[in-house]
């Protein structure tokens, strides 16, 4: 048996980007790591030229992780930089609740990173708070839209908000600029991931911008503050909609209704479909001005028919402990229309 080896030697001419040295200044950053790596591709048997990222022009590899606390000089040896992407992780944590309360941080991709010739895939902020002491509020520079099948996001990036507690499988949703969500309050540790979907993110980068603040602790898993536009229908969905709202979780929407408008609240199912093992699933719709509330037992009754609200109102959903396979997920919409009669 003769062993035959067939190989090819490829001499790569440095591309324009390879001649450049890029400075990534992470010296003022804390608890941050930046990874440049090959983006996943379908395996093919065809030979693909190497694609390397070099640190200080000396150490070259297909993957490179840069950590905070210093300045890094990097260069590329690659025929096609679209084969690489960047993933960044940054942790913002609070250990002393007295020091952190009301403190704010800007969740923005540093310009150094945006200027690199490699596409940013994910920039994740892990936001950690002392348990049962503080909660978090996310305030976007531009109001957000929740991505739903009925109204998908069509921007070049989205914010993916999920719980960062290992035991908790809770995904609040995907949000993009250009909607009606003014702020998102969350009870405990979360990760906020800015995910890009198109190279045009570079041009749209100015639309990104979230501020996170540490606020006094509250018991609900999440509170969405919604200020609908008169022009469009707002679609809102319960967190974890594909897997169902976690057991015994409560979420609320604070929906503002301008003085000259009427809000129509519509649910997209007749029944919630949840079957409870322990407790019951309830939805409470409460008028903020009069405090009058309507209570619906989601596991026993049909969902309400479209209702009209002349004043700001709350929608609160509290889950039971459901039987497997019969989970709670609700989609509803809010539409504003001008008031025809003054109903003060």
């Amino acid at each position: 048996g003769i062993l035959r080896l067939q190989f090819q030697v490829l001499v790569q001419h440095p591309q324009n980007e390879s001649n450049k040295i890029y400075v990534v200044d992470l010296s003022n950053e804390r608890a941050m790591s930046l990874t440049i790596e090959p983006r996943p591709v379908k395996q093919s048997r065809k030979f693909v030229p190497g694609c390397f990222v070099c640190l200080e022009s000396r150490t070259c590899s297909s993957n490179l992780t840069l950590t905070s606390g210093s300045k890094h000089k990097i260069s590329f040896l690659c025929d096609d930089l679209t084969r690489l992407w960047m993933n960044v992780e940054k942790t913002i944590s609070c250990t002393d609740h007295r020091y952190c309360q009301r403190k704010s941080y800007s969740l923005q991709v540093p310009s150094d990173i945006l200027h690199l010739p490699v596409e940013l895939h994910d920039f994740s902020w892990k936001l950690l708070v002392p348990k049962d002491r503080l909660s978090l509020v996310l305030v976007p520079a531009q109001k957000l839209q929740q991505h739903t099948h009925e109204k998908p996001c069509n921007t070049s990036f989205s914010y993916l908000v999920a719980s960062a507690i290992p035991s908790q499988d809770l995904y609040f949703g995907s949000f993009c600029p250009g909607g009606s969500i003014k702020q998102i309050q969350v009870k405990q540790n979360i990760s906020v991931t800015l995910r890009t979907f198109a190279p045009s993110f570079q041009q749209e980068a100015s639309r990104q911008g979230l501020t996170v603040s540490f606020i006094p602790y509250f018991k609900e898993e999440g509170v969405f503050t919604v200020t609908p536009d008169t022009k469009s229908k707002v679609y809102l969905r319960t967190p974890n909609w594909d897997r169902g709202l976690p057991s015994l979780t409560s979420v609320s929407w604070n929906i503002s209704v301008p003085r000259d408008q009427v809000a129509c609240l519509t649910f997209f199912k007749e029944r919630s479909g949840v079957v409870c093992q322990t407790g019951r699933a309830f939805m409470i719709i409460q008028e903020q001005r009069t405090r009058a509330e309507e209570i619906f037992s989601l596991d026993e009754d049909v969902l309400p028919k479209p209702s009209f609200h002349h004043h700001s109102f709350w929608v609160n959903i509290s889950n039971c402990s459901p039987t497997s396979g019969k989970q709670l997920d609700l989609l509803f919409s809010v539409t504003l229309t001008p008031r025809t009669v003054d109903l003060t």
């Epitope: 407790g279 509330e293 309507e294 037992s297």
Partner: antibody
Framework: EVQLLESGGGLVQPGGSLRLSCAAS????????MNWVRQAPGKGLEWVSA????????YYADSVKGRFTISRDNSKNTLYLQMNSLRAEDTAVYYC???????????????????WGQGTTVTVSS | DIQLTQSPSFLSASVGDRVTITCRAS??????LAWYQQKPGKAPKLLIY???TLQGGVPSRFSGSGSGTEFTLTISSLQPEDFATYYC?????????FGQGTKVEIK
């Protein structure tokens, strides 16, 4: 003031029918599940039936299943109990009672009957 | 269906006495239990829900404890207005059932 007022009781022959009503006031009736509970002379309390706030779910004790029907008219703030094929053992004072909805240790549920009517007497006798 | 057994069925006590009534469930009901007080010719009154939570307006001499299958209602110092019949009721889904009752009489 939160109040429940039963009516419709009376004397009926075995095999006969009767319809009890319970008029509610002082609270948002449609928000709460409602119950019928009875008490035979000199005996203890017996839960009879319940209905969810929206009327979408109904529940019955085995002793009345198939004979009694609970219903509600939220526009009239009224709870009903239609009793058919009455037997001597159905003789009792019938109370309507409101379920309380409370959250206890993170679990929201019905946690007992916090408001009761004064009761209406049903006598089944020939 | 879940059966509830109360003990004792009758209890004679004096004003100032500490009184304990027991309620046993035929299967585990977590803390899904309520206690009611009923006086002759009157409708029952909710005293305690979720096994140990005192209903608003109920005097603090009443207390409840237990979980699973064994529950107790305690009156720390019996008052003249406490002579009545007491019922436990399970709240763990429908059908709901009551215990047979415990009559507290004056000794």
């Amino acid at each position: 003031e939160v109040q429940l007022l039963e009516s419709g009781g009376g004397l009926v022959q075995p095999g006969g029918s009767l319809r009890l009503s319970c008029a509610a006031s002082g609270f948002t009736f449609s928000n709460y599940a409602m119950n019928w509970v009875r008490q035979a002379p000199g005996k203890g309390l017996e839960w009879v039936s319940a209905i969810s706030g929206g009327g979408g779910s109904t529940y019955y004790a085995d002793s009345v299943k198939g004979r009694f029907t609970i219903s509600r008219d939220n526009s009239k703030n009224t709870l009903y109990l239609q009793m058919n094929s009455l037997r001597a053992e159905d003789t009792a004072v019938y109370y309507c009672a409101k379920e309380s909805i409370t959250m206890v240790r993170g679990v929201m549920d019905y946690y007992g009957m916090d408001v009761w009517g004064q009761g209406t007497t049903v006598t089944v006798s020939s | 269906d879940i059966q509830l057994t109360q003990s004792p069925s009758f209890l004679s006590a004096s004003v100032g006495d500490r009184v304990t009534i027991t309620c046993r469930a035929s299967q585990g009901i977590s803390s899904y239990l309520a206690w009611y007080q009923q006086k002759p010719g009157k409708a029952p009154k909710l005293l305690i829900y979720a096994a140990s939570t005192l209903q608003g307006g109920v005097p603090s001499r009443f207390s409840g404890s237990g979980s699973g299958t064994e529950f107790t209602l305690t009156i720390s110092s019996l008052q003249p207005e406490d002579f009545a019949t007491y019922y436990c009721q399970h709240l763990n889904r429908f059908p709901r059932t009551f215990g047979q009752g415990t009559k507290v009489e004056i000794k």
